[in-house]
Interface confidence: low
């Protein structure tokens, strides 16, 4: 297993609709044709998998139908969007990239993007 550099922004603020987007960029050392991208969430020293997708270079990034993630790829960049976020989902979101094929296998893990999610204030009741 060979190491690979992965870069991602340090901080992202989710929108009022609970959507956060960030770019995950990897320094590809070879002619990868099959790439796997995994988003991990680290909170209170616990790491959980948020979503994962495998894509072939030049093709779309396909997450599972029920995934909270969507994404697009362009060269060595993956544009990731996580939706449905709430304040309790605030945490460090780590981008893990694996060059699955052809060999050799490369693995890169970013330093993480701290996503801050602020639940919108509920609208005050209106009297008509």
């Amino acid at each position: 297993c060979k190491a690979m550099h992965v870069a991602q922004p340090a901080v992202v603020l989710a929108s009022s609709r609970g959507i956060a987007s960030f770019v995950c960029e990897y320094a590809s050392p070879g002619k990868a044709t099959e790439v796997r991208v995994t988003v991990l969430r680290q909170a209170d020293s616990q790491v959980t998998e948020v979503c994962a997708a495998t894509y072939m270079m030049g093709n779309e990034l396909t997450f599972l139908d029920d995934s909270i993630c969507t994404g697009t790829s362009s060269g060595n960049q993956v544009n990731l969007t996580i939706q449905g976020l709430r304040a309790m989902d605030t945490g460090l979101y780590i981008c893990k990239v694996e060059l699955m094929y052809p060999p050799p296998y490369y693995l890169g893990i970013g330093n993480g993007t701290q996503i801050y999610v602020i639940d919108p204030e509920p609208c005050p009741d209106s009297d008509f």
């Epitope: 002619k31 044709t33 099959e34 796997r36 495998t54 072939m56 270079m57 093709n59 396909t62 699955m100 094929y101 052809p102 060999p103 050799p104 296998y105």
Partner: antibody, heavy 122, light 107 residues
Framework: QVQLQQSGAELVRPGASVTLSCKAS????????MHWVKQTPVHGLEWIGT????????AYNQKFKGKATLTTDKSSSTAYMELRSLTSEDSAVYYC???????????????WGQGTSVTVSS | DIQMTQSPASLSASVGETVTITCRAS??????LAWYQQKQGKSPQLLVF???TLADGVPSRFSGSGSGTQYSLKINSLQPEDFGNYYC?????????FGGGTKLEIK
């Protein structure tokens, strides 16, 4: 003409290891990946993994990580697969097969070895 | 992992007949599909790749088709040498998996 000549049948004890060989001829060994495939009556054909003879780089089916180790010897154009901690589940016919490098579309497994039968029995 | 479901598991046909074998992938494999023929005690032989391109030396009575998750291999005017086992395999993302096989027997 392209040929992949595999080593002969093996009868091995449970817990032991075995190394299978696949000697390539009729083409430039380093221009193609070497893949290994397992065949049993129960599970059919299963892709084990691949090695790039030029770099020694490997990619494995997660199911066979820790079970199979792929290596090559460029000087003799031979690929090897070591299988360890053998159990009855490893009894199968194992094939080597080549695949063109770096093609993610039209490079497929075009030539196969004749297969090596491995029987694990005490 | 992408699973390949092949059907039928077996079929009997007569020389001269036309048969079709199908393979369904559990996800879109974008035509990254190969078909192999295997005779008893022999190694698999490549028939079709890219879902529809015939490998060198394969007779034109064989044809592959399909897209997305559904693929098929058609054999026109069956010849005695066509009987044996047929397998599909995807090359979309590792691990590359094979279908369970179709045993084509002489009726």
């Amino acid at each position: 003409q392209v040929q992949l000549q595999q080593s002969g049948a093996e009868l091995v004890r449970p817990g032991a290891s075995v190394t299978l060989s696949c000697k390539a001829s009729g083409y430039t060994f380093t221009d193609y990946e070497m893949h290994w495939v397992k065949q049993t009556p129960v599970h059919g054909l299963e892709w084990i993994g691949t090695i790039d003879p030029e770099t020694g780089g490997t990619a494995y089916n997660q199911k066979f990580k820790g079970k199979a180790t792929l290596t090559t010897d460029k000087s003799s154009s031979t690929a090897y697969m070591e299988l360890r901690s053998l159990t009855s589940e490893d009894s199968a016919v194992y094939y080597c097969t080549r695949r063109g490098k770096y093609g993610n579309y039209d490079y497929v497994m075009d030539y196969w070895g004749q297969g090596t039968s491995v029987t694990v029995s005490s | 992992d992408i699973q390949m479901t092949q059907s039928p598991a077996s079929l009997s046909a007569s020389v001269g007949e036309t048969v079709t074998i199908t393979c369904r992938a559990s996800g879109n494999i974008h035509n990254y599909l190969a078909w192999y023929q295997q005779k008893q005690g022999k190694s698999p032989q490549l028939l079709v790749f890219n879902a529809k391109t015939l490998a060198d030396g394969v007779p034109s009575r064989f044809s592959g088709s399909g897209s997305g998750t559904q693929y098929s291999l058609k054999i026109n005017s069956l010849q005695p040498e066509d009987f044996g086992n047929y397998y599909c395999q995807h090359f979309w993302s590792t691990p590359w998996t094979f279908g369970g096989g179709t045993k084509l027997e002489i009726k």
